[in-house]
């Protein structure tokens, strides 16, 4: 006989994303004996809620519990049993939530209680069900990328650990309801609001974050279908051959386009509307989203809101990922430049439908937007956050790092785990295996 | 209100072309819809054919994409189907429909439903020798 | 293509009774978040009339006691209570994905 040596025994935590348009569980898991390791938490699963986002549930709030309990079931049979009790689970809602809660606040306590009380019907150690901030969710989707690509620390081959002189990445992320930029800067913030102060194993960072609420993919969708409606009577965005028929009510239920409303409107009444494949239209129609006006900083990025040049390399997710791999996968065009970009959205938008189609067999579903969704990434990347060719060169777009999904989940439930200390790690003695 | 009609020979020989026409009444053709045929076999299965566009454009179910053809005259408010090389498995009920994307909201998230609202009474093919 | 299984092939309810109708599709007709799934009612020598569109949003001019449910694969229409003028064959259908299919039906008979 021999000894063999086990296995560590591993951790696990569990994020329930409840976004916009639908929700997300993400497990996560590490080594029990390596908790303050950096880059030694990866996920473990995942699995899609079916249906909406949880604040499509507002009428029926026990149905957004409801629709957890298939991937709550897949938890189950994921984790290991006797890990269960000790395996923390959170549930963190973001826009649409925070919109829901705008308009409707008894609505959203209704949801996240009708949440809350499935959740603790699970062995999980539940510790809550919230709306996260737009700050939280710009600053968590930063921790993840740049935990995920060890940014923060690392360990070297002389057994020390050392911070990188790569520096961390900052992070873009366009959600349904509301799009986050995030990045460190050396100066500090002229909006105190806009800056976060973090300390990671030792090191400090000045981190700058703002997140737009109502320029999230789907809201920029539906405020443009608003625009093109009051000034064209049709959608320049849309292919033509395209054709809807839309419900008003549908179109002003949100909070994003309450200022785009008519004054006396039918909101039962159907109104026609075609596409028109105008790319130029298209940009002028999504150039109204961004108001350049009055800054009452040394310098903003749109709607008066203030931000520092962007500077170094940035990670992309969500929306934007989804939106340049259409670009580059479906319809196999170059966006390495923002000149690319540009010239990728307009291609797409001097598409037929038809043409649209027969490039894209099969899909069918919001097939229609991806003009729009194109150039408004084009436009909110290079008019709205002021990236240059320079600088969108150090842009990356990706849904992955180490096989994790990009996003704030793993960066959530990092914090409220304290699974990155603020003291930096001392050098460590142990035995090699090897 | 909108209507539609099927119209044409209710016997066809096997290997021959089949040709129907649908007549629309109360809607222009070029204004909007998308014209759809869809035919019912006899044990009541459904089959969505093709259908061209207000614009003129078309879209076949790639099953029938060979032997399918739908075409349209504006000037009568007409739209046709010829199915050609037809065999007894092309017996079937054959209706004419408009159909439109019904943009609906889910969440806070706007999509765009496909449904077939406008139908034809239908008119019966059978193909035999 | 996506195949649309109903259960049952057929079934008889009594009148002011719950009807209820089962689609099973053989992949997800769920895109961003929405259900691309739609149902039709055909009474004999008829043609099929949309009912339900999205999974659940009823078409305007159709009785609440229709009602449908559902996302992913799984998806369900409620007739309740059953009226004699709801005896006919109901087919659930798919937009998610080109080409648009149809289940094979479900005929419901008023006892």
């Known amino acids: 006989t021999r000894d063999v040596r086990e296995p560590p025994a591993l951790k696990y935590g569990i994020v329930l994303d409840a976004g916009s348009s639908h929700t997300s569980m993400f497990i996560y898991k590490w080594p029990a004996d390596k908790e303050n390791d950096t880059g030694i938490v990866g996920q473990h699963s995942s699995c899609d809620v079916p249906g909406g986002g949880i604040s499509s549930y507002a009428d029926n709030p026990s149905g957004a519990s409801q629709s957890l309990v298939g991937c709550l079931e897949q938890a189950l049979q994921d984790v290991p049993k006797e890990r269960h009790a000790g395996t923390p689970l959170y549930l963190g809602a973001t826009a649409g939530m925070r919109l829901l809660n705008l308009t409707n606040p008894e609505a959203s306590t209704s949801v996240l209680m009708a949440v809350t009380h499935t959740l603790t019907q699970y062995p999980f150690d539940f510790r809550g069900a919230r709306i996260l901030s737009g700050q939280e969710e710009g600053v968590f989707g930063w921790v993840t990328a740049n935990y995920l690509l060890e940014n923060f620390i690392k360990y070297g081959w002389v057994g020390r650990w050392f911070r990188p002189r790569k520096g961390t990445l900052g992070a873009m992320d366009l959600g349904g309801a509301s799009t986050q930029i995030t990045f460190e800067t050396t100066s500090p913030a002229e909006d105190r609001a806009s800056e976060v102060q973090l300390h990671l194993y030792g090191q400090h960072y000045r981190v700058y974050t703002h997140s737009f609420l109502c320029y999230g993919r789907d809201q920029v969708l539906q405020r443009l279908l608003a625009s093109a409606l009051q000034t064209h009577g049709f959608h320049p965005c849309w292919p033509r051959g395209f054709s809807t028929q839309v419900l008003l009510g549908d179109v002003y239920q949100s909070p994003c386009t309450m200022a785009q409303r008519p004054q006396n409107f039918n909101s039962s009444a159907r109104v026609s509307l075609s596409g028109s494949s105008d790319p130029h239209l298209c940009r002028d129609l999504v150039s109204g989203l961004f108001s350049f006006s009055s800054c009452p900083f040394s310098r903003c990025s749109f709607n008066g809101v203030f931000q520092p040049p962007v500077a170094g390399n940035f990670v992309a997710f969500s929306a934007f990922f989804y939106t340049v791999d259409f670009l580059r996968t479906s319809m196999g065009l170059p966006v390495a430049t923002l000149q690319q970009l540009e010239a990728a959205a307009v291609n797409v938008c001097n598409q037929t439908w038809a043409q649209l189609q027969a490039r894209v067999p099969g899909q069918r579903a919001r097939l229609a937007d991806y003009c729009a969704g194109a150039m408004f990434v084009q436009q909110l990347l290079s008019r709205g956050y002021g990236f240059d060719e320079r600088a969108f060169g150090g842009v990356i777009f990706q849904k992955k790092a180490a096989d994790t999904a990009v996003g704030w989940a793993l960066g959530y439930m990092l914090n409220l785990t304290n699974l990155i200390p603020a003291d930096p790690p001392g050098l460590r003695k142990g035995t090699d295996f090897s | 209100d909108i209507q539609l009609q099927e119209s044409g020979p209710g016997l066809v020989k096997p290997s021959q072309s089949l040709s129907l026409t649908c007549s629309v009444t109360?809607?222009?053709?070029?204004?909007?819809?998308?014209w759809n045929w869809i035919r019912q076999f006899p044990g009541n299965k459904l089959e969505w054919m093709g259908y061209?566009?207000?614009?003129?454009?078309?879209n076949y179910n790639p099953s029938l994409k060979n032997r399918i053809s739908i075409t349209r005259d504006t000037s009568k408010n007409q739209f046709f189907l010829k199915l050609s090389s037809v065999t007894t498995e092309d017996t079937a009920t054959y209706y004419c429909?408009?159909?439109?994307?019904?943009?609906?909201?889910?969440?806070?998230?706007?999509?765009?439903?496909?449904?077939?609202?406008?139908w034809g009474q239908g008119t019966s093919v059978t193909v035999s020798s | 293509d996506t195949v649309l299984t109903q259960s049952p092939a057929s079934l008889a309810v009594s009148l002011g009774q719950r009807a209820t109708i089962s689609c099973k599709a053989s992949?997800?007709?769920?895109?961003?978040?929405?259900?691309?799934m739609n149902w039709y009612q055909q009474k004999p020598g008829q043609p099929p009339k949309l009912l339900i569109y999205?999974?659940?949003n009823l078409e305007s001019g159709i009785p609440a006691r229709f009602s449908g449910s559902g996302s992913g694969t799984d998806f369900t229409l409620n007739i309740h209570p059953v009226e004699e003028e709801d005896a006919a064959t109901y087919y659930c259908?798919?937009?998610?994905?080109?080409?648009?299919?149809f289940g094979g039906g479900t005929k419901l008979e008023i006892k």
């Open positions: 429909a408009g159909g439109y994307y019904r943009y609906g909201l889910g969440s806070y998230s706007g999509s765009y439903y496909y449904v077939m609202d406008y």
């Open positions: 109360g809607y222009s053709i070029t204004s909007g819809y998308y």
């Open positions: 061209i566009s207000y614009d003129g454009d078309n």
């Open positions: 992949q997800s007709v769920d895109y961003d978040g929405n259900s691309y």
């Open positions: 999205a999974a659940s």
């Open positions: 259908q798919q937009s998610n994905e080109d080409p648009p299919t």
